[in-house]
Interface confidence: medium
């Protein structure tokens, strides 16, 4: 059952990176509008994006309340200009989203190398601890705050003069690696949550190389 001349939303898809979470769907509306509802399994339906002609709805404010909860959303279709109008059975058409658990499923954003510092044959590489939209006590938590030791970083590094890559891993945001004296190195990092079954890895960070502006080069 449903509303005459409206079509149900389809292809409901969660798009989420570092907990910034948007629900997308199709089709582009023709003479209809949408309202989204979201709930947790232990929560209740909350309406968002009232009577919108968009085909996306930012649900970040809801999911950051508890990123370990599992969320379900649904998209209602109403005829444009008469949102009280419903079909013969009295209900607007709606479609359910897949379930979404932010902690397990949000994509890890591309990390950034904050700095690197060489001291003799050691280089300390620091990864920027990206701020998320998850709040605690009115402050925004970083990715490390949220994931703790579940989050590791993999460092790829190589001599500027060769293509042979080495790797290092850390469950903090810092690497301390051995390098050959007098050689310039390039670095790239990747965020990883090894315990996950999906969305385990981020894309690689932009490459940073010694001898460029970034970081600090000190030979002692």
């Amino acid at each position: 059952s449903g509303t005459t001349n409206t079509v149900a939303a389809y292809n409901l898809t969660w798009k989420s990176t570092n907990f910034k979470t948007i629900l997308e769907w199709e089709p582009k509306p023709v003479n209809q509008v949408y309202t989204v509802q979201i709930s947790t399994k232990s929560g209740d339906w909350k309406s968002k994006c009232f009577y919108t002609t968009d085909t996306e709805c930012d649900l970040t404010d809801e999911i950051v309340k508890d990123v370990k909860q599992t969320y379900l959303a649904r998209v209602f279709s109403y005829p444009a200009g008469n949102v009280e109008s419903t079909g013969s059975a009295g209900e607007p058409l709606y479609e359910n989203s897949p379930e979404f658990t932010p902690y397990l499923e949000t994509n890890l954003g591309q990390p950034t190398i904050q700095s690197f510092e060489q001291v003799g044959t050691k280089v300390n590489v620091t990864v920027e601890d990206e701020r998320t939209l998850v709040r605690r006590n009115n402050t925004f938590l970083s990715l490390r705050d949220v994931f703790g030791k579940d989050l590791i970083y993999t460092l790829y590094y190589w001599k500027s003069s060769s293509s042979g890559k080495k790797t290092a891993k850390t469950n903090t945001n810092e690497f301390l690696i051995d390098v050959d004296k007098g050689e310039n190195y390039c670095f790239s990092v990747q965020a990883v949550i090894p315990s996950r079954t999906v969305n385990r890895k981020s894309t690689d960070s932009p490459v940073e190389c010694m001898g460029q502006e970034k970081g600090e080069f000190r030979e002692i």
């Epitope: 059952s1 232990s42 929560g43 209740d44 339906w45 909350k46």
Partner: antibody, heavy 118, light 107 residues
Framework: QVQLVQSGAEVKKPGASVKVSCKAS????????MHWVRQAPGQGLEWMGM????????SYAQKFQGRVTLTVDTSTSTAYMELSSLRSEDTAVYYC???????????WGQGTLVTVSS | DIQETQSPSSLSASVGDRVTITCRAS??????LNWYQQKPGKAPKLLIY???RLHSGVPSRFSGSVSGTDFTLTISSLQPEDFATYFC?????????FGQGTKVEIK
């Protein structure tokens, strides 16, 4: 264990307002919605509205829109239901009940009898 | 608003009887149908949620099922403490609504 303790019975005159409190304990107050349901003497149950204590977002049944106000005080884990412009047909037992899933009420207060009489 | 029509509105039964109460929703509610028990002067108690899931602490003689748009609460063997009023309630669509109740009395 989860407990919802409501304020005592009230007698009000038509046109007046009443404010019923519901003190929650045994769980994290801001994690679960609080709903209000009323029951007139010898009648069925009627859902009035709900509030999300984490951000005070409310949703009311159309019938009560404009007459009911749900609020929370997170510092004391207390929810409030205020009903204005009372009439005799508002005589009922008012329950607070904790949401435990979409439209699912697993925990209830003991009820507060509100009598509207001139 | 969605309406739930409960039947019967009352019934008389004996201890040990199998009792069935039906609730028909006026429109689709997925499986968001819950059952409550209420005794005089007391708050309702959740028995069954999401059509057929038994709430913790509820005896296994209570069960729920659905066939089409008809939702059923069954008490397999009525006990003395089961004499009460039973309500169905839909949690799919706002506003949430209850059936008018079924009073189970001693024969």
């Amino acid at each position: 264990q989860v407990q919802l303790v409501q304020s005592g019975a009230e007698v009000k005159k038509p046109g007046a307002s009443v404010k019923v409190s519901c003190k929650a304990s045994g769980y994290t107050f801001t994690t679960y919605w609080m709903h209000w349901v009323r029951q007139a003497p010898g009648q069925g149950l009627e859902w009035m509205g709900m509030i999300d204590p984490s951000d005070s977002y409310t949703s009311y049944a159309q019938k009560f829109q404009g007459r009911v106000t749900l609020t929370v005080d997170t510092s004391t884990s207390t929810a409030y239901m205020e009903l204005s412009s009372l009439r005799s047909e508002d005589t009922a037992v008012y329950y607070c009940t904790r949401g435990s899933g979409p439209g699912l009420f697993a925990y209830w207060g003991q009820g507060t009898l509100v009598t509207v009489s001139s | 608003d969605i309406q739930e029509t409960q039947s019967p509105s009352s019934l008389s039964a004996s201890v040990g009887d199998r009792v069935t109460i039906t609730c028909r929703a006026s429109q689709g509610i997925s499986n968001y149908l819950n059952w409550y028990q209420q005794k005089p002067g007391k708050a309702p108690k959740l028995l069954i949620y999401h059509t057929s899931r038994l709430h913790s602490g509820v005896p296994s003689r209570f069960s729920g099922s659905v066939s089409g748009t008809d939702f059923t609460l069954t008490i397999s063997s009525l006990q003395p403490e089961d004499f009460a009023t039973y309500f169905c309630q839909q949690g799919n669509t706002l506003p949430y609504t209850f059936g008018q109740g079924t009073k189970v009395e001693i024969k």
